[in-house]
């Protein structure tokens, strides 16, 4: 079957890294510089991706595979195949339309990317706040207030807990 197919379509013999050149009686020609073909039987080669500006070359383009980019330090990749580079912020911040802004009271971000998220509401799980939240860290929930009543357990009770989400600024 392969032999029959190749007799019908000489281009099917052209391997990756080449293209079937219609201008030269369908001879397999190597991809020109800065282009590639990742599969056989292609009639054109694709232009290599160029990593410019904040995009850095992670893998050079070859005749059979496209270049791959990542982001320069201070930026991180977004999208499939690192189609975008987004500026980092500090922990405790988020990137807004007006730049890196501190998380609002009651929210936190423990990464250099992404958005500020609300502190965990310990009381929803019937627990109390063991460690207060900050811009950079979520609250830590402790045992439920009932667990802290005298004689309820032999565990030493923690310091008196503040209201959920309370953080001294």
């Amino acid at each position: 079957f392969e032999r029959t197919r190749s007799l019908q379509d000489p281009c099917s013999n052209c391997p990756a890294g080449t293209f079937c050149d219609n201008n030269r009686n369908q001879i397999c020609s190597p991809c020109p510089p800065n282009s590639f073909s990742s599969a056989g039987g292609q009639r054109t080669c694709d232009i290599c991706r160029q990593c410019k500006g904040v995009f850095r070359t992670r893998k050079e383009c070859s005749s059979t595979s496209n270049a791959e980019c990542d982001c320069t330090p201070g930026f991180h990749c977004l999208g499939a195949g690192c189609s975008m580079c987004e500026q980092d912020c500090k922990q405790g911040q988020e990137l807004t339309k007006k730049g890196c802004k501190d998380c609002c009271f009651g929210t936190f971000n423990d990464q250099k990317r992404g958005i500020c998220r609300p502190w965990t509401n310990c009381s929803l799980d019937g627990k109390s706040v063991l460690v207060n939240g900050t811009k950079e860290r979520d609250v830590v929930c402790g045992p439920s207030p009932a667990d802290l009543s005298p004689g309820a357990s032999s565990v030493t009770p923690p310091a008196p807990a503040r209201e959920p989400g309370h953080s001294p600024q």
Epitope: R49, G53, C69, L78, M84, E86, Q87, L95, T96, G99
Partner: nanobody, 122 residues
Framework: EVQLVESGGGLVQPGGSLRLSCAAS????????MSWARQTPGKGFEWVSG???????YYTDSVKDRFTISRDNAKNTVYLQMNSLKPEDTAVYYC????????????????WGQGTQVTVSS
């Protein structure tokens, strides 16, 4: 072919001013958002400023009230007026298209100029 050519860089004393220009060709400039970035050996790349096609402007905090981005659609040129320059503004300044319209974000389809060196020193 898209081309962005920056000019106007140079050596300036602290407190001085410079006006960078970026001449654009090969695309519909008037409907394109544009941006400026800078690169320093120490800090790497930094998003500096952007301007939408409607003239809305955006700045990173460190240059607010000192730098002004503007555009002249008749000349296919975007400008960065830099006043009260500080030694920490020393960098290579790049002009780039800004297709994402998002602060601090560029896409792989954006185009970049070759950059112009700005040195602030006494």
């Amino acid at each position: 072919e898209v081309q962005l050519v920056e000019s106007g860089g140079g050596l300036v004393q602290p407190g001085g001013s410079l006006r960078l220009s970026c001449a654009a060709s090969g695309f519909t400039f008037s409907s394109s958002a544009m941006s400026w970035a800078r690169q320093t050996p120490g800090k790497g790349f930094e998003w500096v400023s952007g301007i939408y096609s409607d003239g809305s402007t955006y700045y990173t905090d460190s240059v607010k009230d000192r730098f002004t981005i503007s555009r002249d659609n008749a000349k296919n040129t975007v400008y960065l007026q830099m006043n009260s320059l500080k030694p920490e503004d020393t960098a290579v300044y790049y002009c780039a298209t800004w297709g994402t319209l998002r602060f601090g974000v560029w896409a792989e389809y954006d185009h970049w100029g070759q950059g112009t060196q700005v040195t602030v020193s006494s």
